[in-house]
């Protein structure tokens, strides 16, 4: 309304004993320039005198007189727009209402601003996003309803009492709309941050502690798992039993389902934290892991490589190459599935053991006709000796020998 002076400033300002208060303020008088300004503390209107009573913190008239004891209060304004004030230092008993008594040539106005001065530095306030999820960056905000040019402060972030390594952005506002100091820290929380305490610490310019606020991080994450196997080396013999246990070291929220995977494929009807494999066979060798899910998603354990050891299976012989031409070279390969791998081989030619041949491969550099026939082998490992397989036939081609005419 046009009959009022127009003021803009924060409604309430906050400070603490010994700090300072900076009051950003603008105004528009009804007519002409400001001629007199008095800053009252808790002003009360006296109907008898038609004047305001209260402690005068600052006075400025046409004569320019300022009470000498009020050097801590400064009017930083002007005669037509700016009514900014500074109180440095500010004291506990400055709390209450500040009254800005303004007078122009023909008009008067009393503008009230609330001042809240606490005994000790009040804590900042940490603001967290509604949900924090592992590996998704979040911004933590620390807000303090205080800023003053004459009293530098800093906000520091701590994780479990140790300064955080991530960089923060600190901003201050000293405007007619708001007065605050804010620190924003962006970081990528990991599951291990769940339950940890984050602190925003208010410090003076020298790093001295003034106050703080703390929050406990609630980091949503997939289940974190540990897999244990008995025996611990995951090496067993055919017919033995194996037990695998899945342990949830952390899950937020709680887990809902459990499953086991072998070589990436889900094992049917295995939905408990223990996987019992009785009388294992060699086909049960492979990579096992457990998978536990919660509302965030599935978590997988590390893989355990189960080795089921068995004696060599009946062996087969591969010949490179048959038929072979006399004088060429030939290689025989004994093939037998076994775990561990065979360490010894026995070779047979036409059912008769070949002396001195104990390797997986037999190499004949120069084939002769008498080398023709059936070759078989037997593989052996620490668990036993395999059976001799059917063998392979070597055919040797050669030119006619001892030609006789009939």
């Amino acid at each position: 309304d046009s009959s009022k002076w127009v003021f803009e400033h924060p409604e309430t300002l906050y400070a603490w004993e010994g700090a300072c208060v900076w009051i950003p303020c603008t105004y528009r008088a009804l007519d002409g320039d400001l001629e007199s300004f008095i800053l009252f503390h808790n002003p009360e209107y006296n109907k008898n005198t038609s004047k305001f009573d209260g402690t005068r913190l600052y006075e400025s008239t046409k004569d320019g007189k300022v009470p000498s004891e009020q050097k801590r209060v400064q009017f930083l304004g002007d005669k037509n727009k700016n009514c900014t004030l500074s109180i440095h230092p500010v004291h506990l008993n400055d709390s209450g209402q500040l009254g800005l008594r303004m007078e122009s040539k023909t008009e008067k106005w009393m503008e009230r601003i609330h001042l809240n001065v606490s005994e000790r530095p009040f804590p900042p306030h940490i603001q967290l996003p509604p949900e924090i999820q592992e590996s998704q960056e979040v911004t933590l905000t620390c807000l303090l309803n205080f800023s003053c040019y004459g009293y530098p402060i800093q906000l520091q972030w701590l994780l479990e009492g140790v300064p955080m390594r991530q960089a923060a952005v600190t901003s201050t506002s000293l405007t007619i709309k708001s007065v605050f100091t804010r620190s924003e820290l962006k970081f990528s929380p990991q599951w291990s941050h769940h339950g940890k305490i984050v602190t925003c610490q208010l410090q003076d310019a020298d790093g001295k502690f003034l106050s703080n606020d703390t929050v406990q991080l609630n980091v949503k994450h997939t289940p974190k798992l540990e897999i244990k196997v008995t025996p611990s080396d995951a090496i067993v013999r055919e017919g033995d039993s194996v037990t695998m246990t899945c342990e949830v070291s952390s899950s937020n929220p709680e887990y809902t389902t459990v499953s086991w995977l072998k070589d990436g494929t889900s094992l049917k009807k295995q939905n408990t934290f223990t996987l019992n494999l009785r009388e294992v066979t060699k086909d049960q060798s492979g990579k096992y892991c457990c998978q536990v899910s919660n509302d965030v998603g599935p978590g997988r354990s590390e893989e355990v490589f189960l080795q089921v050891q068995y004696a060599p299976e009946p062996s087969t012989v591969q010949i490179l190459h048959s038929p072979a031409v006399e004088g060429s070279q030939v290689e025989f390969l004994c093939m037998s599935l076994a775990n561990p791998l065979p360490t010894n081989y026995t070779w047979y030619h036409n059912g008769k053991e070949m002396q001195g041949r104990t390797e997986e491969k037999v190499h004949i550099p120069k084939i002769l006709p008498w080398h023709a026939g059936t070759y078989s082998c037997v593989a052996e490992n620490i668990l036993g000796t395999g059976q001799r397989g059917p063998g392979a036939e070597l055919d040797v081609q050669y030119p006619p020998k001892k030609v006789t005419t009939v």
Partner: antibody, heavy 119, light 106 residues
């Protein structure tokens, strides 16, 4: 192992824009931040900006109006785009990854790509 | 932004000597990071979190400091240590580097 490699145009005309690609291996761009740092010949290092695992960015305020950082997680590539280049933008441009997910010093650097701004 | 001032700008020393260079911050930082750079190469992280040695860095390098004052020390200078050393802060955006200390062999 962790590796980063920059590739750029080499020569850029004044007032034109610059595009550099950083191709990474040995880690996931969806989990780690990647930063851009430049170094004019014979001078010191200047941090340009960064891209977070989730894709949000932070820039050096002095260059913010000219910079854009983006990425393609599936191709393991991070892109730096800079507009209105002047001769004082001539520098070696590096991409770097911190020790941790988002902090801890630049433990991994690319070999750098030299960008010369000249007519 | 936080300004990091390194001193001295140039340092000449002989093999076997102890070398100390400093980095002063315009406002308090939580941790300091140190890099070594040789001509034609990318920077190499030497020290992280003020005093921790990065992987593969010889134990003759050490870092210390707090608040606004930090230092990098080489207990016994070796010929291969001749390089430019940069400090860097990770407390406030924008991340900033010092102008560098050039370490030369006498």
């Amino acid at each position: 192992q962790v590796q980063l490699k920059e590739s750029g145009p080499g020569l850029v005309a004044p007032s034109q824009s610059l595009s550099i690609t950083c191709t990474v291996s040995g880690f996931s761009l969806s989990r780690y931040t990647v930063h851009w740092v430049r170094q004019p010949p014979g001078k010191g290092l200047e941090w340009l900006g960064m891209i977070w695992g989730g894709g949000s960015t932070d820039y050096n305020s002095a260059l913010k109006s000219r910079l854009s950082i983006s990425k393609d997680n599936s191709k393991s590539q991070v892109f730096l785009k800079m507009n209105s280049l002047q001769t004082d933008d001539t520098a070696m441009y590096y991409c770097a990854r911190p020790h941790d997910f988002d902090a801890g010093g630049f433990a991994y650097w690319g070999q750098g790509t030299l960008v010369t701004v000249s007519a | 932004q936080i300004v990091l001032t390194q001193s001295p700008a140039i340092l000449s020393t002989s093999p076997g000597e102890k070398v100390t260079m400093t980095c002063s911050a315009s406002s308090r930082v939580n941790y300091m990071y140190w890099y070594q750079q040789k001509p034609g190469s990318s920077p190499r992280l030497l020290i992280y979190d003020t005093s921790n040695l990065a992987s593969g860095v010889p134990v003759r390098f050490s870092g210390s400091g707090s608040g606004t004052s930090y230092s990098l020390t080489i207990s016994r200078m070796e010929a291969e240590d001749a390089a430019t050393y940069y400090c860097q802060q990770w407390t406030s955006y924008p991340l900033t580097f010092g102008a560098g200390t050039k370490l030369e062999l006498k």
